[in-house]
């Protein structure tokens, strides 16, 4: 009998109002077992997947996508899901990343705290995973 | 079907350096962390290094046994990975192996690997 | 760093034997443990991930079991082609590592 997969949850830091150049990453969290995560914007049709997974708890693992560079083609409304096999996962609630002008530049400390959707909330970072900066911009053919 | 070829082993004096190289195909590879695990002659397995993806910094990790000797890293464009081995020892002789990495760690795919033995 | 324990280093078995072969972690790996399986020459298969999610491909034959710091690698009814040696492997911290190995031999 094949279990029933839990939603995954959504959060972006460092926050959902990001200003115009300044950096946000999505984090993904599933269960552990999670082979693939998938980041999608707006729409099944626009996603990004990643296999390279973090264990972030006893319980769970995570995927982190990053955009280096926000722009307002960026803003919009994102969500995750994830492949435990042998099957997908339902999506997690949206996530509305909204796109602001700076006017203190990126280093500007005037985004909100970090935001999160989804059934679960995000338990501390376990001491014994390697939990390594993010920086990669989200795939141009599937994101931009 | 998953590809992953090593090469650039060989027989070095000890001190000396080699660099390894791994050409991977039929997968996404920036997706993908990726290891190289060795095992020495009629020995058990020895995972030696990680690196991550770009999404995750490129981040690397070593065995206590290697770090400050050795170097991974990636060329993505390229679906190529890297070992550069300097101040070798016979410790070092083994079958080096590059690997996958699955679920956060875990190792799915591995390349039929490449021999270093280290020797005067 | 996790120690990973093996029950026995080598095992005499007879065709058709149900096999269990042991791995005892140091500390608590909360089931980021897998196995492998690797045959003279060739280099390792990973049969099981996660302690119990047989990979696909691998025969119903093997399966996994455990949690905590003790997991088990079971063979339901032994085959030629399953001689080989298996290890374990945690990849719930870095360094990973792998248990010592158990060979399985043919009476």
């Known amino acids: 009998q094949e279990e029933d997969l839990p939603r995954p949850s959504i959060s972006a830091e460092p926050g959902t109002v990001i200003p115009l150049g300044s950096h946000v990453t999505f984090v993904c969290r599933g269960p552990v077992g999670v082979q693939t995560f998938r980041l999608e914007r707006d729409s099944r049709s626009t996603y990004n997947d990643t296999e390279d997974v973090s264990q972030a708890s006893p319980s769970e693992s995570e995927a982190r996508f990053r955009i280096d560079s926000v722009r307002e083609g960026n803003a919009g409304l994102y969500r995750c899901i994830y492949y435990k096999p042998p099957k997908w996962s339902e999506q997690s609630d949206y996530l509305e990343l909204l796109v602001k002008e700076s006017s203190g530049g990126p280093d500007s400390p005037d985004t909100e705290p970090g935001s999160s959707a989804g059934p679960t909330q995000r338990p501390s970072d376990n001491s014994h995973n390697e939990h390594a900066p993010a920086s990669q911009g989200l795939k141009a053919e599937h994101l931009y | 079907e998953v590809q992953l070829v090593e090469s650039g082993g060989g027989l070095v004096q000890p001190k000396g350096s080699l660099k390894l190289s791994c050409a991977a195909s039929?997968?996404?590879?920036?997706?993908?962390?990726m290891h190289w695990v060795r095992q020495a002659p009629g020995k058990g397995l020895e995972w030696v290094a990680r690196i991550r993806t770009k999404s995750n910094n490129y981040a690397t990790y070593y065995a206590d046994s290697v770090k400050d000797r050795f170097t991974i890293s990636r060329d993505d464009s390229q679906s190529m990975l890297y070992l550069q081995m300097n101040n070798l020892t016979t410790e070092d002789t083994a079958m080096y192996y590059c690997v996958r990495d699955r679920y956060g760690g875990a190792m799915d795919y591995w390349g039929q690997g490449t021999s270093v033995t280290v020797s005067s | 760093d996790i120690q990973m324990a093996q029950s026995s280093s080598s095992f005499s078995v007879s065709l058709g034997d149900r096999v269990t072969i042991t791995c005892k972690a140091s500390e608590d790996i909360y089931i980021r443990l897998a196995w492998y399986q690797q045959k003279p020459g060739n280099a390792p298969r990973l049969l099981i991930s996660?302690?119990?999610s047989l990979e696909t491909g691998v025969p119903s034959r093997f399966s996994g079991s455990g949690s905590g710091k003790d997991y088990t690698l079971s063979i339901t009814s032994l085959q030629t082609e399953d001689v080989a040696t298996y290890y374990c492997?945690?990849?719930?911290?870095?360094?990973?590592?792998f248990g010592g190995g158990t060979r399985l031999e043919i009476k």
């Open positions: 039929d997968f996404t590879f920036n997706t993908y962390a």
């Open positions: 492997q945690q990849y719930w911290s870095t360094p990973y590592t």
């Open positions: 996660t302690a119990t």
